[in-house]
Interface confidence: low
């Protein structure tokens, strides 16, 4: 033979202060017939929290429509929750008797505890930019949870990553909580376009972990690689010499041309172009004018890159006396 | 000019872990400015991108794969690896290597031949 | 994953037609599209990347266009030789993802 149970499947229920908890019962059987009533605590001194015939529940409404006979859901919702609302609740279901109902059965209990959400994570990053194969440190913080047990996750470009140091304080009882985390990432030459994740997962959030990010736009620097090239062709008395850097970053770039040692003040062509991995390249183009006294020209190309030390490339012109004594415009 | 060749058993287990390797001759995987990839081809189908390693180790993987998927990279021997466990005759593909520049012509502008690995008993 | 739709899924045409086949992505990938030559046994070749540029050593009759969601990828005059199947791949995202491709065939 079939026997009633009283289902109620959430052991421990976490609520925020002022919001509404939904304590669920079900019930597997509508015999024998009788009301099911909602209690907190258990004994002689349990406290009666709704009763559908008799009573004013204020802040109790029920989930499904009780009046209906075939109803099994005896689920309710307390508003407005409070410190004092903590507790452990039972449906009970009551056997119709005369002169007055017999307690038939309990269902095992819904612990409601207070809980708190953390806050948006924070993730901040190092202070000063460092270069790709360098490791960096990222840190994370979430504040006012409750309770204290929480899950917090890295992640780099959507990979989980295992480099970190995650604390929870305090360390005994507490109102709330904080979470403190540190990981430690390697960088990429294209990590001007990554992102550090920091993902922080706790049973108030019911399942949609709050997440902080850093670019490691912020800390990276990609240092440029320079090539100084005399172009074959010459236009009249004039080489032109070019100065490429490449896959720099952040943009922030000075460049200088040199002639034997003097630097030039003349205005140079340039363009700046963008690399798919945020990189940028800068092209820089200096006119020579050729002259038979102008036989050991030595051009330097000096590029300072966001505040570091200057770095320099050196070409010795190759100037022919073929080329010397060409007259038209453009001679290879 | 950089070339790649795949090479690993062409004939797998069910259940078993496919391995394959790609040797990269008149280039260095260390020297940078690319990454390794894995694209699979099933037969008569399209491309499947699998996952990518940098000569650093730093990898990324497809999402669909990626709780099977391994990418490996040994400089010294100028090789990189895929690894993909618990195969199913699925998994029966032409699995292609390539490098992946990171500026410049971003595509898989080095392709291996491709190697056929069916899986069956 | 970003969704490339390629059309039509096959095709045929005479040598010296204009072949046009067509991209499109599920969400903006800007320019961040290759196309791809596949032959019968081979591995794929890069014939266009960044959308609309011609890798070294590719004829010129091949072209690319296009931006954001939508990428046209041309033969301006058919020839034998082009007889292949054509991706398009995106890399703005990772994953990279491949279109279902285009068979193209001389009639």
């Known amino acids: 033979e079939e026997e009633l149970q009283m289902i109620q499947p959430e052991k421990l229920l976490l609520v925020t202060v002022g919001k509404t908890a939904t304590l669920h019962c079900t019930v597997t059987s509508l015999l024998p017939v009788g009301p099911v009533l909602w209690f907190r605590g258990v004994g002689p001194g349990r406290e009666l929290i709704y009763n559908q015939k008799e009573g004013h529940f204020p802040r109790v409404t029920t989930v499904s429509d009780l009046t209906k006979r075939n109803n099994m859901d005896f689920s309710i919702r307390i508003s407005s929750i409070t410190p004092a609302d903590v507790g452990t609740y039972y449906c009970v279901k009551f056997r119709k008797g005369s002169p007055e109902n017999v307690e038939f059965k309990s269902g095992p209990g819904t612990e409601m505890a207070l809980g708190a959400k953390p806050s948006a994570p924070v993730v901040l990053g190092p202070a000063a930019r460092t270069t790709p194969e360098h490791t960096v440190s990222f840190t994370c913080e979430s504040h006012g949870f409750s309770p204290r047990d929480i899950t917090l996750k890295w992640f780099k470009n959507g990979n989980e990553l295992s480099d970190f140091q995650t604390n929870v304080d305090p360390t005994g009882q507490s109102v709330a909580y904080s979470i403190r985390s540190t990981a430690r990432v390697v960088l990429d030459p294209w990590d001007v376009r990554s992102q550090v994740i920091c993902e922080v997962a706790h049973v108030t959030l019911q399942g949609d972990p709050l997440r902080g990010t850093a670019n490691l736009s912020e800390a990276i620097r990609v240092p440029p690689t320079l090539e100084v090239t005399q172009q074959p062709m010459r236009v009249g008395n004039q080489v032109n010499v070019t100065c490429q850097v490449r896959k720099f970053y952040p943009q922030s770039l000075q460049l200088t041309w040199s002639e034997n040692g003097n630097v030039c003040q003349r205005e140079t062509a340039s363009t700046l172009t963008e690399n798919k991995d945020g990189t940028y390249n800068w092209t820089s183009w200096f006119l020579v004018n050729i002259s038979d006294q102008r036989d050991d020209v030595v051009l330097t190309c000096q590029v300072k890159h966001d505040g570091q030390l200057a770095v320099s490339k050196r070409l010795a012109l190759e100037v022919t006396v073929h080329q010397k004594d060409q007259s038209s415009d453009a001679t290879p | 000019q950089v070339q790649l060749q795949e090479s690993g058993p062409g004939l797998v287990k069910p259940s078993q872990t496919l391995s394959l390797t790609c040797t990269v001759s008149?280039?260095?995987?260390?020297?940078?400015?690319?990454?390794w990839s894995w694209i699979r081809q099933h037969p008569g189908k399209g491309l499947e991108w699998i996952g990518y390693i940098y000569y650093s180790g730093s990898t990324y993987y497809n999402p669909s794969l990626k709780s099977r998927v391994t990418i490996s990279v040994d400089t010294s021997k100028n090789q990189f690896s895929l690894k993909l466990s618990s195969v199913t005759a699925a998994d029966t593909a032409v699995y292609y290597c390539a490098r992946e520049g990171l500026d410049g012509s971003y595509g898989s502008s080095a392709w291996g031949q491709g190697t056929l690995v069916t899986v069956s008993s | 994953d970003i969704q490339l739709t390629q059309s039509p899924s096959s095709l045929s045409a005479s040598v010296g037609d204009r072949v046009t086949i067509t991209c499109q992505a599920s969400?903006?990938?800007?320019?961040?599209l290759n196309w791809y030559q596949q032959k019968p046994g081979k591995a794929p070749k890069l014939l266009i990347y960044?959308?609309?540029n011609l890798e070294t050593g590719v004829p010129s009759r091949f072209s690319g266009s296009g931006s954001g969601t939508d990428f046209t990828f041309t033969i301006s005059s058919l020839q034998p030789e082009d007889i292949a199947t054509y991706y398009c791949?995106?890399?703005?995202?990772?994953?990279?993802?491949f279109g279902g491709g285009t068979k193209v065939e001389i009639k």
């Open positions: 969400q903006d990938i800007s320019n961040y």
């Open positions: 008149g280039g260095s995987i260390s020297s940078g400015g690319y990454y």
């Open positions: 960044d959308a609309s």
């Open positions: 791949q995106q890399f703005a995202y990772l994953p990279y993802t």
